[in-house]
């Protein structure tokens, strides 16, 4: 048993039929010695008396909020949560496996630049009685500070018969130098509590590997005289690290017909303009990627040819 | 990656072209190592990230863009003790910090060159003949060092009398390539920045 936060405890259980469970001793937080009784949740039935209560925790029915009282007055609470281990593996019932970029990916994180700010998100089909808390650090043995906000519900989607809920959190490394070469990864730890079930999820990454620039901005077309060609121009996104001559981007320009089956013309360039042939009903899209370290491409910025 | 190969303008900062070739060569070598050594811990997640230049050079700090010198987090260990000479410097624009920066890059390349050559000598003794260092990568390191043209004592190649442990050597190769790729990215950013200024 260990303390998750004040008055909230996690009991780690091997989960198999007829498992013996864990013997837990709860101590009433009071200087009083006599006349103490214990109850569970909203029930008034006395489970035991004395300053300590010993319980055998085997399943969720044994978890909950234990309260010690004296003479009708509440002295203290202890909320017991369960963390299940099945076949040596901690349960992952609360979050959905996003399967990207690999199986057992429950947390996904992205950064728009090298400032040390990043966003992580996760998915669940659970809609109520759900709380998350997020901690992060750079490295684990001698951790350096990363500050995370509160996790918030950021999107709801319908997937077949199920509703899917996306939660996200923003974190910022306390003292980040955009030009630094990372040797220790960022560690992100999410505690998830659904009703009386506790689970934890972790992710470890370098900012450089989760970079995904915002799409290029101010995408414009300038027709060239007596030609089907147009000059496409764009700018670096505002959120990208500066100076741009140090944190350079490379770009992919794509001409796409109305039909998805039509052949796409693609040009790669380090410049912020390109000359392409604009077909009728086609659209021109541009996306960006770090020029020197191949992490993710940005989403496309698009304009119609007409 | 399907990108056009940049061909430098004649008046271009002379080291930019070499640094781009360096990044391409080390990235290719790292990819080859990951594929060839697929049953070894050779991915970014699996290896320990070691920097052989730590406490010996300070390329990131010495080469910091002017715009980032206001960032306290970037200034924790500025070094100011490098040789100041080198042909990449367009003389009028030469600044003390720029000289420190380029000499720090030179020292990095020299250190990696020695490590890679020593390692290659060991890998050539491996009866499995599983992987060797790409001669192109070694040549590109050499070219960039020549372009930087700093006078510096030659470091003798390390020789080892004991029988090489090929498994450990291959793990070390992965660690070295990952670290060198990160440094090559920094070098490319620096050259791009100097070229623009």
């Amino acid at each position: 048993i260990w303390e998750l936060k004040k008055d909230v405890y996690v009991v780690e259980l091997d989960w198999y039929p007829d498992a013996p469970g864990e013997m837990v001793v709860l101590t009433c937080d009071t200087p009083e010695e006599d006349g103490i009784t214990w109850t569970l949740d909203q029930s008034s039935e006395v489970l035991g008396s004395g300053k300590t209560l010993t319980i055998q925790v085997k399943e969720f029915g044994d978890a909950g909020q234990y309260t010690c009282h004296k003479g009708g007055e509440v002295l203290s609470h202890s909320l017991l949560l369960l963390h299940k281990k099945e076949d040596g593996i901690w349960s992952t019932d609360i979050l959905k496996d996003q399967k990207e970029p690999k199986n057992k990916t429950f947390l996904r994180c992205e950064a728009k630049n090298y400032s040390g700010r990043f966003t992580c998100w996760w998915l669940t089909t659970i809609s109520t009685d759900l709380t998350f808390s997020v901690k992060s650090s750079r490295g684990s043995s001698d951790p350096q500070g990363v500050t995370c906000g509160a996790a918030t519900l950021s999107a709801e989607r319908v997937r077949g018969d199920n509703k899917e809920y996306e939660y996200s959190v923003e974190c910022q490394e306390d003292s980040a130098c955009p030009a630094a070469e990372e040797s220790l990864p960022i560690e992100v730890m999410v505690d998830a509590v659904h009703k009386l079930k506790y689970e934890n999820y972790t992710s470890s990454f370098f900012i450089r590997d989760i970079i995904k620039p915002d799409p290029p901005k101010n995408l414009q077309l300038k027709p060239l005289k007596n030609s089907r060609q147009v000059e496409v121009s764009w700018e670096y996104p505002d959120t990208w690290s500066t100076p741009h001559s140090y944190f350079s981007l490379t770009f992919c320009v794509q001409v796409q017909g109305k039909s998805k089956r039509e052949k796409k013309d693609r040009v790669f360039t380090d410049k912020t303009s390109a000359t392409v042939i604009c077909r009728k009903n086609a659209s021109i899209s541009v996306r960006a990627q770090d020029r020197y370290y191949s992490s993710s491409w940005s989403e496309w910025a698009s304009v119609p040819c007409s | 990656r399907n990108l056009p190969v940049a061909t430098p303008d004649p008046g271009m900062f002379p080291c930019l072209h070499h640094s781009q070739n360096l990044l391409r060569a080390v990235s290719n070598m790292l990819q080859k190592a990951r594929q060839t050594l697929e049953f070894y811990p050779c991915t970014s997640e699996e290896i320990d990230h070691e920097d052989i230049t730590k406490d010996k050079t300070s390329t990131v700090e010495a080469c910091l863009p002017l715009e980032l010198t206001k960032n306290e987090s970037c200034l924790n260990s500025r070094e100011t003790s490098f040789i100041t000479n080198g042909s990449c410097l367009a003389s009028r624009k030469t600044s003390f910090m720029m000289a420190l920066c380029l000499s720090s890059i030179y020292e990095d390349l020299k250190m990696y060159q020695v490590e890679f050559k020593t390692m290659n000598a060991k890998l050539l003794m491996d009866p499995k003949r599983q992987i060797f260092l790409d001669q192109n990568m070694l040549a590109v390191i050499d070219e960039l060092m020549q372009a930087l043209n700093f006078n510096s004592e030659t470091v003798p190649q390390k020789s080892s009398l004991e029988e090489p442990d090929f498994y450990k050597t291959k793990i070390k190769l992965c660690i070295l390539l990952h670290a060198f790729r990160i440094r090559a990215v920094t070098i490319d950013r620096v050259m791009s920045y100097l070229n623009a200024s």
Partner: nanobody
């Protein structure tokens, strides 16, 4: 709908024995403590015995050495074996259980049975 149904109450002679049973049915997620209470005419309801989910019993002074509480978690039942009954044990005996239901599946609430009459004649 959750129901607690007591059975086994009847008229018995002093010194005799009775076994009361209580079965919880309906939508039940889990049961914590189960207990027997009694209320004699003109008196307040008082606790007789409690048994925790883990099977630990606790008795009121009046029930010690004479009464035994037991439960079957698989069947959601609780029993009270009463021996050496006295006229002062005459009362309506109520079963009480702390239940979690699908609507309150992580909070125990108290539920009561309707009671069963035990009369001990001298």
């Amino acid at each position: 709908e959750v129901q607690l149904v007591e059975s086994g109450g009847e008229l018995v002679q002093a010194g005799g024995s009775l076994r009361l049973s209580c079965a919880a049915s309906g939508s039940i997620v889990s049961i914590s403590a189960m207990a027997w209470y009694r209320q004699a005419p003109g008196k307040q309801r008082e606790r007789v015995a409690t048994i925790t989910r883990g099977g630990t019993p606790d008795y009121a002074d009046s029930a010690k050495d004479r009464f035994t509480i037991s439960r079957d978690n698989a069947k959601n039942t609780v029993s009270l074996q009463m021996n050496n009954l006295k006229p002062e044990d005459t009362a309506v005996y109520y079963c009480k259980a702390a239940l979690r239901t699908p609507t309150h599946d992580y909070n125990y609430y108290d539920y009561w049975g309707q009671g069963t009459q035990v009369t001990v004649s001298s």
